[in-house]
C-alpha cells in the first residue's frame, strides 16, 4: 500500500454529503451504494460514516461531467471514472463521480419492475427465456407489445418476472392521468401506433392517452426506455426498435451477430437492411458501490496500490464479495488504526447559509477501449432461435398519479420566448424571485420573467416567458407562489400584496391584511398544502395556519418556523412543496423536507431535512 | 531515465500548417496526461492543450480551439500536435510536458518532465 | 480564468541571500499550485508540487508555502545557479493558468 504524503482526517468520525445524483440509478440505491462503500473501510478501521446534508461535510460527493469546477475535467465514458482529492480542508477529501459514464451495481443497468410476480425487483441482465438469452426487456413471449424482463437469471427455471417501463404501463406528466398510451392515436389527422416527437420541438417522445387527441387533448410522454438506449453507432441516445430486420432475419433483442467482437447491438428503426441505423446496447455499466469505495480509499489518505487484487489497484474490475485485500486493511489500519470504533456522533445539520465548494473533478480507474464508429459488420446469417409462445401473465394496469402538465404541441398560450435581461440563462440566475409546482411543472420567477422546468431526461427546460404575459395582472418582481393542490388556483405574493387566479380570472390584488396578517408582515415566502384545504403560509422565521377557502390565516395558529421544520433556515426567502417535498431556499442553496402533508399534525421524526443541494444545479439540473 | 523529445518545429507561412511530435521513454506513457505548453520569444508559459491516457478526452487552450489537434499512439509512446491555420502569434517554443498526476487520485499537481522545446515560427 | 500574479517581477539579490518570491490567486485554488525554475534556453523544472511539496532532486533550500490564493517560494539561501525565472502554476480550476513570472537576478 501506499499514503498520500501522509495527510489523513485527524479525526474518525468522518461526514459526507451527497450533493446531487446520477440519473442511471434510483436514489436510494445510490445512498446505499455510497454508505456500503464507507462501511468497506468502517469494517476494517476505527472510523464511522455519517451522512450530512450540506457543505460542512468532510467529503462532499458530487456527479458531474467534463469540465465540473475543479481543475481536473472528466472524460466522457470510460477511461477516468472517478477522483477524489487526499483528506483536508475545503475540496479536499472530496470525491467526483463522472455522470458520463453508465452506473450500475456492476451487472447493467438497473430497470425497476411493475406488477409481475417480484415485487418491484429489478429486471436480472442477462436472463434466460426459452433457453435464450436477454440483455434488456423484452416483448417476447407477449402478443400486446408489453416489454418484460425475469428478475433471476433463468425464467424458464425461476419464473419470476415483471413489467419494465413502458408506455403501455403507464405515461409520465402531461395531463392523461398516468394512464397508458392508446394504440394507435390521432394526431393532427393522422394516425400514430407508437410514442412521437411530432409537434412537439424539445425531442420528448409522448402519445394520446385516448384513441384521439385531436378531440379528447389528453396526453402524457412515454417512459425512457433504459435498457434500450443506444450508445455508440450512428444513432446514439435513440432507442432499440424491436423486433428489428437484419440480413432478413427478425430480432427481438440485442444481438452480437454480424460482429466479430462480440458486442451486443440492435437496430434503431425496424429494418436494419434498408435503414443501416444502429448503436450498441447498454454495457454492465461499472460498479457505483466498487468505484465509490475505492474513491473513499484515496478520500481517506489511501493511494493506489501496486496489488492487482487490492481495491486500491488502480484499474477497474468488477467483483463479488467484499472487495478488500490484505493490502487494502494495512493501509488503512497504517492511517488510522486497528481500533474498536468511535462512537458515532452526527453533527448537527446547519441552519447557517452553507458556503459552496468547488465541485471536484474525477480521474479515471480504467482504461478501456473506446466505442467503434463503425456499423455491425455482416456476420453470420443464422436466425435467431424462434421467439417463445408462453409469456408471463399481465399484472394489473394502474397508473401512478400524474406530473407536470405541458401541451405536446410547440405552441402554447404562453408567450413565446423574448429577449430576457440581464440573462435568459436561468442558470446564471443567483437566486430566483420565487419558486413553485404550477401544473405540476417547476416555474422560475425572475425579473417578470419566468422558465418551466419539465423533470424528466434530456432538455426539460422551457422558457423564458414573459410572467405577464401569462397572468397579466403581476408585478415585476414576486416573493412567492403557490398552486392550491384541490382547486388549481394559483396565489401569488408581491410585497404586502396577493393575487388568485383561477385559470385566466385573478382576483386581486388583496392586502395581506385582508388575510388577518399585521404590518409587521412584510412579505409572504411560501406556502405549504396541508390536507382538507389548508396550507401553511410562512413570513420571515414565523409559520400560520392558512384556510385556502377564506383565504385567512389563523392567527392563534402563529408558530415559529423551526418549531415544526427543524434544520432549515429560519430566514428562507422562498418556501414551496415540489413530489410531495417541502423545498425552503436560502441563498442559491435549499434545504429539502420531508414533511406530514396533515393539518394540525406536527410530526417531529417527519419533518426532518433530508437533502440540501443548490437550486441550479439539483432542482434545475444545470451542467 | 525520463526522456521527452520534440520535434517538428521550423519556419512556416500564416495559415499554414505543420504536426509537432514527442517521444516519450522512461516511463509508461500509457497512464499519464500528456501536455504542449508553449512559450513566446521573452514572454511566459502558456498550456495549449491536454490529452488523457486513453486519447479519449482533449482539451484545448481558447487560443487554439478549432485550429490544433492533440493526439497520442500509446503504441509508440508518441505524443502528436496537429497545429493547422497557423498565425503569427502562434510563433514560441513549444514543450511536451508529462503530468505528475496519475490516475484518479487528485493532488500531484505539476509538470515534473519536460522535453527540450522546439521552435515552430510562423512568419511570411 | 483564474489569473495569477507573481511578485516582484524582477528580484535582485546576492548569493547567499534568502529569496522570497509570491504568487496570488484571484480566488480560492487550495493548494494545487506548483512552482517552476527556468533557466536561458532550458525547459522549465518543477520544482515545487501542491504548494509545499519538493519534487525529486530538488535541494532542501527551496520551500513552498501557502494555500487558498497566497502562495510563497523561499529559498533560504541562494546559490550561483539559482538565478533563474520563477514560474507558479494552478490547477485548482480549470483551465490551469501560469503566473507571469519573477526574474531573480544577482545584484
Known amino acids: 500500500f501506499q499514503t498520500f504524503k501522509g495527510l489523513k482526517w485527524d479525526h474518525h468520525n468522518i461526514t459526507y454529503w451527497i450533493q446531487n445524483y446520477s440519473e442511471d440509478l434510483p436514489r436510494d440505491m445510490i445512498d446505499d451504494a455510497f454508505a456500503r462503500a464507507f462501511a468497506v473501510w468502517g469494517e476494517v478501521a476505527p472510523l464511522t460514516f455519517t451522512r450530512v446534508y450540506g457543505p460542512e461535510a468532510d467529503i462532499v460527493i458530487q456527479f458531474g461531467v467534463a469540465e465540473h469546477g475543479d481543475g481536473y475535467p472528466f472524460d466522457g465514458k470510460d477511461g477516468l471514472l472517478a477522483h477524489a482529492f487526499p483528506p483536508g480542508a475545503g475540496v479536499q477529501g472530496d470525491a467526483h463521480f463522472d455522470d458520463d459514464e453508465l452506473w450500475s451495481l456492476g451487472k447493467g443497468v438497473v430497470i425497476p419492475t411493475y406488477y409481475g410476480n417480484s415485487n418491484g425487483a429489478p429486471c436480472h441482465f442477462p436472463f434466460t427465456f426459452e433457453g435464450r438469452s436477454y440483455s434488456a426487456c423484452t416483448t417476447d413471449g407477449r402478443n400486446d407489445g408489453t416489454p418484460w424482463c425475469s428478475t433471476t437469471a433463468d425464467y424458464d427455471k425461476d419464473g419470476k418476472f415483471g413489467f419494465c417501463p413502458s408506455e403501455r404501463l403507464y405515461t409520465e406528466h402531461g395531463n392523461g392521468e398516468g394512464k397508458p398510451c392508446v394504440f394507435p392515436f390521432i394526431f393532427e389527422g393522422r394516425s400514430y401506433s407508437a410514442c412521437t416527437t411530432k409537434g412537439r420541438s424539445d425531442g420528448y417522445r409522448w402519445c394520446a392517452t385516448t384513441a384521439n387527441y385531436d378531440q379528447d387533448k389528453l396526453y402524457g410522454f412515454c417512459p425512457t426506455r433504459v435498457d434500450a438506449t443506444v450508445v455508440g453507432g450512428n444513432s446514439a441516445g435513440e432507442l432499440c426498435v424491436f423486433p428489428f430486420v437484419f440480413l432478413g432475419k427478425q430480432y427481438s433483442s440485442c444481438t452480437s451477430d454480424g460482429r466479430r467482437d462480440g458486442r451486443l447491438w440492435c437496430a434503431t428503426t425496424s429494418n436494419f437492411d434498408t435503414d443501416k441505423k444502429w448503436g450498441f446496447c447498454p454495457d454492465q455499466g461499472y460498479s457505483l458501490f466498487l468505484v465509490a469505495a475505492h474513491e473513499f480509499g484515496h478520500a481517506l489518505g489511501l493511494d493506489h496500490s501496486s496489488v492487482p487484487e487490492a481495491l486500491m489497484y488502480p484499474l477497474y474490475s468488477y467483483l463479488e464479495g467484499f472487495p478488500l485485500n490484505k493490502d487494502d486493511i494495512d493501509g488503512i489500519q497504517y492511517l488510522y488504526g486497528r481500533g474498536s470504533k468511535p462512537d458515532p456522533r452526527p453533527p448537527a445539520t446547519t441552519t447557517t447559509e452553507p458556503q459552496p465548494t468547488a465541485p471536484p473533478t474525477m480521474c479515471p480507474t480504467i482504461p478501456p477501449t473506446a466505442y467503434p464508429t463503425v456499423g455491425p459488420t455482416v456476420g453470420p446469417t443464422g436466425a435467431p432461435s424462434p421467439g417463445p409462445t408462453s409469456s408471463p401473465s399481465p399484472g394489473p394496469t394502474g397508473a401512478p398519479s400524474p406530473g407536470p402538465t405541458a401541451p405536446p404541441t410547440a405552441g402554447s398560450s404562453e408567450a413565446s420566448t423574448e429577449s430576457l435581461s440581464p440573462a435568459d440563462n436561468p442558470c446564471n440566475v443567483d437566486v430566483f424571485d420565487a419558486i413553485a409546482e404550477i401544473q405540476g411543472a417547476l416555474h422560475f420567477f425572475k425579473d417578470g420573467w419566468y422558465w418551466k422546468f419539465l423533470n424528466h431526461r434530456g432538455s426539460p427546460l422551457q422558457g423564458p416567458f414573459l410572467t405577464a404575459r401569462t397572468w397579466p395582472a403581476l408585478p415585476a418582481t414576486l416573493d412567492s407562489a403557490f398552486e392550491d393542490p384541490q382547486t388549481k388556483r394559483v396565489f401569488f405574493f408581491s410585497g404586502r400584496q396577493m393575487w388568485v387566479y383561477t385559470g385566466k380570472t385573478v382576483l386581486g390584488p388583496r392586502s395581506l391584511d385582508k388575510l388577518g396578517l399585521g404590518p409587521e408582515v412584510t412579505h409572504v415566502s411560501g406556502l405549504l398544502p396541508r390536507r382538507l384545504g389548508k396550507a401553511l403560509l410562512f413570513s420571515k422565521g414565523r409559520v400560520w395556519r392558512f384556510d385556502l377557502k377564506s383565504q385567512k390565516v389563523d392567527p392563534q395558529s402563529v408558530i415559529r418556523v423551526d418549531k415544526e421544520f427543524s434544520g432549515v433556515p429560519w430566514n428562507s426567502h422562498d418556501i414551496f412543496q415540489y413530489q410531495d417535498k417541502a423545498y425552503f431556499c436560502h441563498g442559491k442553496f435549499f434545504w429539502r423536507v420531508s414533511f406530514q402533508n396533515e393539518v394540525n399534525k406536527v410530526d417531529h421524526e417527519v419533518n426532518q431535512v433530508d437533502d440540501v443541494g443548490y437550486v441550479t444545479y439539483d432542482l434545475l439540473q444545470c451542467p | 531515465e525520463v526522456q521527452l523529445l520534440e520535434s517538428g518545429g521550423g519556419l512556416v507561412q500564416p495559415g499554414g500548417s505543420l504536426r509537432l511530435s514527442c517521444a516519450a521513454s522512461g516511463f509508461t506513457f500509457s497512464v499519464y496526461d500528456m501536455w504542449w505548453v508553449r512559450q513566446a520569444p521573452g514572454k511566459g508559459l502558456e498550456w495549449v492543450s491536454v490529452i488523457y491516457p486513453s486519447g479519449g478526452a482533449t482539451y484545448y487552450a481558447d487560443s487554439v480551439k478549432g485550429r490544433f489537434t492533440i493526439s497520442r499512439d500509446n503504441s509508440k509512446n508518441t505524443l502528436y500536435l496537429q497545429m493547422n491555420s497557423l498565425r503569427a502569434e502562434d510563433t514560441a517554443v513549444y514543450y511536451c510536458?508529462?503530468?505528475?498526476?496519475?490516475?484518479?487520485?487528485?493532488?500531484?499537481?505539476?509538470?515534473?518532465?519536460w522535453g527540450q522545446g522546439t521552435l515552430v515560427t510562423v512568419s511570411s | 480564468e483564474i489569473v495569477l500574479t507573481q511578485s516582484p517581477a524582477t528580484l535582485s539579490l546576492s548569493p547567499g541571500e534568502r529569496a522570497t518570491l509570491s504568487c496570488r490567486a484571484s480566488q480560492s485554488i487550495s493548494s494545487f499550485l506548483a512552482w517552476y525554475q527556468q533557466k536561458p534556453g532550458q525547459a522549465p523544472r518543477l520544482l515545487i508540487y501542491d504548494a509545499s511539496y519538493r519534487a525529486t532532486g530538488i535541494p532542501a533550500r527551496f520551500s513552498g508555502s501557502g494555500s487558498g490564493t497566497d502562495f510563497t517560494l523561499t529559498i533560504s539561501s541562494l546559490e550561483p545557479e539559482d538565478f533563474a525565472v520563477y514560474y507558479c502554476q494552478q490547477r485548482g480550476n480549470w483551465p490551469i493558468t501560469f503566473g507571469q513570472g519573477t526574474r531573480l537576478e544577482i545584484k
Open positions: 510536458a508529462k503530468d505528475r498526476a496519475y490516475g484518479d487520485y487528485v493532488g500531484w499537481n505539476g509538470f515534473d518532465y
